[in-house]
Every structure is written in structure tokens, then in C-alpha cells.
Amino acid sequence: CSCAPTHPQTAFCNSDLVIRAKFMGSPEIIETTLYQRYEIKMTKMLKGFDAVGNATGFRFAYTPAMESLCGYVHKSQNRSEEFLIAGRLRNGNLHITACSFLVPWHNLSPAQQKAFVKTYSAGCGVCTVFPCSAIPCKLESDSHCLWTDQILMGSEKGYQSDHFACLPRNPDLCTWQYLGVSMTRSLPLAKAEA
């Protein structure tokens, strides 16, 4: 499937719903639809409280039944393994695809785990992670943070992805901020052109 590299903050902000959950088994084809659904057991909701309303949890994650339509294929057989799932909410159901941000919770860095729980939300609607996939690239706005992991690391899983969030420094300026113990340290030259 044609998936653009995504910074975890972008995945968080662009998703209707972000949860921690366990996959309980093989997918079930939904007759007369293009969907299949995985039974899941939600352990924690990280985003989507407003959208969900009174719903106490999600029992299923829906995905296209065909890989050619970006269906998600869950490969892990470990039912006790917890996953971070960032998806869309449609008709009260959680929808995921092969492009969804969906990773084992333990694969996230401690900084990312912390950010999904409480930090990324501060940048949503205010700041934008701007991917730099080819040099030269420059910021188009002071509310953008230049994401250079793909160029510097050759992968979307790099230092900015693992340890930084794009957060408001003041009402008109967003900068990369370190997700370590102190939330006040900025990445040097965060606003410079690459």
C-alpha cells in the first residue's frame, strides 16, 4: 500500500481515535462488505474521548478485506501483546488500514509512550510536523517543524521521531521540544533550513 512516512505526532493528531489494545484472534470477514474485523480488547484510550461519548470500549477494529485496498494484516499471534492503534472513527467503529500507525506498545521509545499519553495533544491543531524528504527543503510557516529523519537517518524512525515533539513555544511559533525529563529543552537550529 502507498503509505507516506508519518511522525508519531502527526499520526496522533490526524487520527480520530488512539488506543492501546490487544488483538484477540484471526480476522472475521463481514459478509456482503469489503471489510474484515479483528476482535480487540482495549486497555486504554489515549485520544477520542469526545468523539466516542459514552462508549466504554471498542470490541472490533475494521479493515479492508483485501490487501489491494490497503487491508491491515495482523501478523503477531501473541494475544497478550499490547499495540498502539491510531485509527479513524466512522459510524461508531474503529477503522484501520495498512497505513495506520499501529505498532507494539513496547516498540515505542519511553519518550514516545509518554508523548502519546500526554504531550502530542498539545501540538494538535497548532503545530505541523513538516516532512523533509529531499534537500533542499525549508519551512513554510513558523508553526511548522522540519522533520529530517528520512534524510539524516534514511528512515522515518529517527531521533526526531523517537525523542521530540513539535510544540508551541509561544502563540506564533512551534519548535521541536525534547521529550525527556525536561520539557523545556529545544532542539538546536530547529527552525533552520535543511
Epitope: C1, L34, L69, S100
Partner: antibody, heavy 116, light 108 residues
């Protein structure tokens, strides 16, 4: 029964882009997939890509990766296919098709002519 | 990608004769994801057979599909004048959708 109505014929210059629309009526637009298929003069059918509007993620044939963008607007029940960096070989009839585990309903086709 | 090879490229027959069209896949395809289409000049394709053997709504009983794995067949038991057209097989099984190159059924 679903009906798919496509936008009209286009004549484009090499290097430019074209955006073809496909409006659906009847059925639940968001829940099924829309695929795009093209057919060059005298040639066979070629799948370009598809999207399920409710999921919002498109998949593209390897051949068209980076040149084609398929989107869907749930509010107007319309799917779009944009092809960029056009060349003369892109002259073809472009079809949208409702997709289940087969293509059960087709648009009337849109002729795109690329000529300098 | 899964490659579908149709044979023959052209089939010259007379009305009333039986037509047998072949579609061979480069790797095994689930029958659920194999379809056949008919296309006439200047028209959009029309679904004939889905799931390898199920006739689409409104398709006459003279059309039938069979096969599994890598070999699939479309049979027209007795050709009517309106059946002379080009026929395509299609698979939606893998990460990509592919069509065969087509078989043209022409009047002998």
C-alpha cells in the same frame, strides 16, 4: 443499483496534470471501494489504484506510484483520480468502477488526450 | 504482481458454437477474487462472472466460469450474435489488481 457518472473529455499538454471525477448515486458511497482503470486506444484494461472512502487510504499500481493520486469526498459521493506529468502514452479512456471482490458497476469513461 | 495470461488472443467462431476461453495465473489465486468481464467497442466493461463461477445479475445462463488455483475458464455454451466481443479475466487477490490481456471472440 449504483450509477457512476464521470466528468467530460479532456485535452492536455505533456507535463501537465488531469483530474477526473466520478460521482456515485445509489448505494452507500463510503462503504464500498472505487477503483480506477485505464484503457489506451486498442489496448487492454490496466488497474491504476483504488480507495475505500470510509478508510481514506488509497492503493496504487506500482506503474503509477508517485504520479497518481486517488481521493474521495464522502460529502458529495465523488471520487477523483489525478494523474500528473502527463505524456502522450497516457492518452486513454479512464474508467472508475465500484469495487467489491470484483468491479460490478462502471462509469461511462473519460477520454484524456495528451498532445502538444 | 500476479500475471494473468489469457489464451487464445483471438477466437474465430460462428454463432451457435461453443467458446472456451482460458486464463492462467502466474501464482495461485483464491477463486473468490477471480472475475470475468465482457467489453464491446466504445463501451465500458461489463461484469459477467465473479468468484470464478458465479454469474452476475442479468447475465445469461450460457455463460459459465470454472477453475481454481492457477487455471480458470470462461465458457459460452452457444454463441449469440451479441456475444462477439473482447473478454478479460481479472484477479484482486494480492497487493495489486491485474487483468489478463484479453481474448477477442470474433465472427468466423
Amino acid at each position: 443499483q449504483v450509477q457512476l457518472v464521470q466528468s467530460g473529455a479532456e485535452v492536455k499538454k505533456p507535463g501537465s496534470s488531469v483530474k477526473v471525477s466520478c460521482k456515485a448515486s445509489g448505494g452507500t458511497f463510503s462503504s464500498y471501494a472505487i477503483s480506477w482503470v485505464r484503457q489506451a486506444p486498442g489496448q487492454g484494461l490496466e488497474w491504476m489504484g483504488g480507495i475505500i472512502p470510509i478508510f481514506g487510504t488509497a492503493n496504487y499500481a506500482q506503474k503509477f506510484q508517485g504520479r497518481v493520486t486517488i481521493t474521495a469526498d464522502e460529502s458529495t459521493s465523488t471520487a477523483y483520480m489525478e494523474l500528473s506529468s502527463l505524456r502522450s502514452e497516457d492518452t486513454a479512456v479512464y474508467y472508475c468502477a465500484r469495487t467489491y471482490y470484483y468491479f460490478d458497476s462502471w462509469g461511462q469513461g473519460t477520454l484524456v488526450t495528451v498532445s502538444s | 504482481d500476479i500475471v494473468l495470461t489469457q489464451s487464445p488472443a483471438t477466437l474465430s467462431l460462428s454463432p451457435g458454437e461453443r467458446a472456451t476461453l482460458s486464463c492462467r495465473a502466474s501464482q495461485s489465486v483464491s477463486s473468490s477474487y477471480l472475475a470475468w468481464y465482457q467489453q464491446k467497442p466504445g463501451q465500458a466493461p461489463r461484469l459477467l462472472i465473479y468468484g470464478a463461477s458465479s454469474r452476475a445479475t442479468g447475465v445469461p445462463a450460457r455463460f459459465s466460469g470454472s477453475g481454481s488455483g492457477t487455471d480458470f475458464t470462461l465458457t459460452i455454451s452457444s454463441l449469440e450474435p451479441e456475444d462477439f466481443a473482447t473478454y478479460y479475466c481479472q484477479q484482486l487477490y494480492g497487493t495489486s489488481v491485474t487483468f489478463g490481456q484479453g481474448t477477442k471472440v470474433e465472427i468466423k
